[in-house]
């Protein structure tokens, strides 16, 4: 039995930050779980981990230097990524694993979300336009 995951096909991070919501076909209430976000077609980089259980508050961490936070819903985890770089534009996959109660459950691989990180462009202010062309 596998959990199904839904995520937006594409998100644009205009301000180098993005909220990526992972929606599950499973209620996480009073479960011990590990939700994670993975970067790349091969999911080689674990971007962020959200760990939750019935007796502790949510714990969020990244071992790979990403600035991330997480929020828990009954059937979702939302990852908030900040300080993203343009070269971190990639496909990102949600993963969910339920550790307790048994049996261990995880998800069918989702379609992923392409996060397109837009660089901050410094545009000339309309009050101070650049030198006019002759």
């Amino acid at each position: 039995n596998k959990i199904l995951v839904k995520q937006s096909p594409m998100l644009v991070a205009y301000d180098n930050a993005v909220n990526l919501s992972c929606k599950y076909s499973y209620n996480l209430f009073s479960r011990e779980f590990r939700a994670s976000l993975h970067k790349g077609l091969d999911s080689a980089v674990e971007v962020c981990v959200v760990y939750g259980n019935y007796s502790q508050q949510l714990q969020v961490y990244s071992k790979t230097g990403f600035n991330c936070d997480g929020k828990l819903g009954n059937e979702s985890v939302t990852f908030y990524l900040q300080n993203l770089y343009v070269n971190q534009t990639d496909i990102y996959f949600c993963k969910i694993e339920v550790m307790y109660p048994p049996p261990y459950l995880d998800n069918e691989k989702s379609n992923g979300t392409i996060i397109h990180v837009k660089g901050k462009h410094l545009c000339p202010s309309p009050l101070f336009p650049g030198p006019s062309k002759p």
């Epitope: 011990e32 590990r34 981990v49 714990q59 071992k63 694993e97 550790m99 307790y100 048994p102 261990y104």
Partner: antibody
């Protein structure tokens, strides 16, 4: 209380295999990885690999990938490390230890160690 | 693999001394570093996790600091039971690797 209890000392001949067990108690077995670490006489600590009992996924140190096999029997909360084609430089104390699967930060509980001696 | 280099490999100190052990990682491991104490014939014991967090039951004379590639374990006032070997370990990426150890001996 939380405990990891390992099997007893073994003496093996070069070329043979050894299988060390590690019985866990006092915690939810499927919430933690079991790692294996060895220590040759007078030497430092060397990580062999780990297994997660929930889905039986393993990670191995490349050095041991072709000779070490990590398994678990969740029904009796026991992990096993089998090392094949033993050589004299495999003589060491082998420890099992655990790290949390959700918060994989450290090895907080260790077995007492199993001495494996390889000698002809 | 990430190489962990500990220094010194051994040191002699007296009870009451302040002792500092350093650990260098061959690449950025952020805060993913632990310190263990091991006595002869025994299994290692966790002292510090995530660079600076004291494990439950460990005396407050032990402290850890650092991030990135350089880390320090400090014993503020060495006690007789602290004579042992200390190891750093990175848990940022597999394979997890240990430093070579620092043996703290009685002067």
């Amino acid at each position: 209380q939380v405990q990891l209890v390992q099997s007893g000392a073994e003496v093996k001949k070069p070329g043979a295999s050894v299988k060390v067990s590690c019985k866990a108690s006092g915690y939810t077995f499927t919430s933690y990885y079991i790692h294996w670490v060895r220590q040759a006489p007078g030497q430092g600590l060397e990580w062999i690999g780990c297994i997660y009992p929930g889905n039986v996924n393993t990670n191995y140190n490349e050095k041991f990938k072709d000779r070490a096999t990590l398994t678990v029997d969740t029904s009796i909360s026991t992990a096993y490390m089998e090392l094949s084609r033993l050589r004299s430089d495999d003589t060491a104390v082998y420890f099992c230890t655990r790290s949390h699967y959700g918060l994989d930060w450290n090895f907080d509980v260790w077995g007492q160690g199993t001495t494996v001696t390889v000698s002809s | 693999d990430i190489q962990m280099t500990q220094s010194p490999s051994s040191l002699s100190a007296s009870v009451g001394d302040r002792v500092t052990i350093t650990c260098h990682a061959s690449q950025n491991i952020y805060v993913w570093l632990n310190w263990y104490q091991q006595k002869p014939g025994k299994a290692p014991k966790l002292l510090i996790y995530k660079a600076s967090n004291l494990h439950t039951g460990v005396p407050s004379r032990f402290s850890g600091s650092g991030s990135g590639t350089d880390f320090t374990l400090t014993i503020s006032s060495l006690q007789p039971e602290d004579f042992a070997t200390y190891y750093c370990q990175q848990c940022q990426t597999y394979p997890y690797t240990f430093g070579g150890g620092t043996k703290v001996e009685i002067k």
